[in-house]
Interface confidence: medium
């Protein structure tokens, strides 16, 4: 149940549709583990990027990390910064995009690697999954054909995020991953950083749609660390 | 907390209909799907398929497609299990399961 | 016919250590697809022991691990005890049946 997906569902290489079950639509805004929209953020482009305040990476989207926008600038002025692509120079995890981590100061692929697209690579962190599967993709591709006209619709089992129709993320819903839907504004999300500490989500939402980011919603900046809620919010 | 209530024991003929109930409390019904496995007598568990509780979409196991139909009621946070043209090997224990939490089962014996 | 094999049977005397293998297919655990391991002690209904291949749920004592290779998923009992006389089950999703399956089995006595 894994494999790297969220720079723009890369993988393209696919089982199934079948299994899972499906969306909430009615549940704009409830905490609850288990809702069926499950989450973290995608990778974004950001046009009008509007600067975001931040105290630490937590407060940002998935694409973006907490930093001064000048090198050396005052470190009390911090923003949220889009996140550096592959080959540009990075100091921690949090700074490369999803896809990416932060190795010899270098934002490097995490395709060969077990830092992998911010849902997928929850999954595999924290679900244990042995790698030895994973290494060559193509091992895929000797299921049966038949697997692999249409994608899948919500509740369909997948493996990645490719696997499933528009709209949809491949997520975790403890037995399996199935297709959920991406979630709307307003809706809350879960924040994941890429620093191999994650919670074990055994119920996962998707990741907020295009031109949403998930950030700490502006009311519950005082709450503790624990207790704030990220919802999807326009950039 | 989470639980699963199920219907009670049940003795059917064969050919008969049998149709049980789960109902789930201390949780967002609406918000999970729910399996449905049975267990024959000294046998393993064997799945049947899921419903999701939102939407009232249903997947079957090839096994049982044709004979069983699977629904829910949101109003009341059930879910039920009807399984047609009873046969003596469907005498099992059938668990609804939210898969993380299972219900204690149904007994269910078919006999003439 | 369950298409995840375990062996049926599996005995150690307390504090020994035991191993359930369960075996599947490029369609089921080598596809990629999770393995959970269920205890299911004599008239009860499964609990879950091991998800997503080898976490374990909070209250779940730290005598069960789970792992995964290739298209074999098991389970391993350190130090085992009374208590863990019971039915074993391994599950995965299989994409060639387009469904959930469990294993076959096995039953772990204590000696």
């Known amino acids: 149940t894994l494999n790297s997906v969220l720079n723009s569902n890369a993988i393209k290489n696919l089982p199934p549709p079948l299994g899972g079950a499906a969306g909430h639509p009615g549940s704009a805004v409830s905490a609850a583990p288990g809702i069926l929209y499950p989450g973290g953020n995608k990778y974004q482009t950001i046009d009008n990027y509007q600067p975001y305040p931040c105290a630490e990476d937590e407060e940002c989207g998935t694409d973006e990390y907490c930093a001064s926008p000048t090198r050396g600038g005052d470190a009390g002025v911090q923003i949220c910064l889009a996140c550096r692509k592959r080959r540009k120079r990075c100091m921690r995890h949090a700074m490369c995009c999803p896809g990416n981590y932060c190795k010899n100061g270098i934002c490097v692929s995490s395709d060969q690697n077990h830092f992998r697209g911010e849902i997928e690579e929850t999954i595999t962190e924290s679900f244990g999954n042995d790698h030895s599967t994973l290494d060559g993709y193509s091992r895929r591709t000797t299921l049966s054909s038949k697997m692999y006209h249409t994608k899948g619709q919500e509740g369909s089992v997948c493996l990645r995020s490719s696997d499933c129709a528009s709209g949809l993320c491949c997520a975790r819903h403890f037995w399996s991953k199935i297709c959920k839907p991406v979630l709307k504004e307003g809706q809350v999300c879960t924040k994941h950083r890429r620093k191999g500490s994650h919670g074990l989500e055994i119920f996962q939402r998707c990741y907020c749609g295009e031109g949403l980011s998930c950030r700490i919603q502006k009311d519950h900046h005082q709450a503790s660390n624990s207790s704030r809620l990220h919802t999807c919010q326009r950039h | 907390q989470v639980q699963l209530l199920q219907s009670a024991a049940e003795v059917k003929k064969p050919g008969e209909s049998l149709k049980i109930s789960c109902k789930g409390s201390g949780y967002d019904f609406p918000g999970y799907y729910l399996h449905w496995v049975r267990q024959a007598p000294g046998q393993g568990l064997e799945w049947m398929g899921w419903i999701n509780a939102n939407s009232g979409a249903t997947n079957y196991a090839q096994n049982f497609q044709g004979r069983v139909t699977m629904t829910r009621d949101t109003s009341i946070s059930a879910a039920y299990m009807e399984l047609s043209s009873l046969r003596s090997d469907d005498t099992a224990v059938y668990y609804c399961?939210?898969?993380?939490?299972w219900g204690r089962g149904t007994t269910v014996t078919v006999s003439s | 016919q369950s298409v995840l094999t375990q062996p049926p049977s599996a005995s150690g005397a307390p504090g020994q250590r035991v191993t359930i293998s369960c075996t599947g297919s490029?369609?089921?655990?080598?596809?990629?697809?999770?393995v959970h391991w269920y205890q299911q002690l004599p008239g009860a209904a499964p609990k879950l022991l091991i998800y997503?291949?080898?976490n374990r749920p909070s209250g779940v004592p730290d005598r069960f691990s789970g792992s995964k290779s290739g298209t074999s998923a098991s389970l391993a009992i350190t130090g085992l005890q009374a208590e863990d006389e019971a039915d074993y089950y391994c599950?995965?999703?299989?994409?060639?049946?387009?469904?959930?399956?469990f294993g076959t089995g096995t039953k772990v006595t204590v000696l």
């Open positions: 490029s369609s089921n655990i080598g596809a990629g697809y999770d």
């Open positions: 399961t939210r898969e993380d939490h």
């Open positions: 997503g291949n080898s």
């Open positions: 599950q995965s999703y299989d994409s060639s049946l387009s469904g959930y399956v």
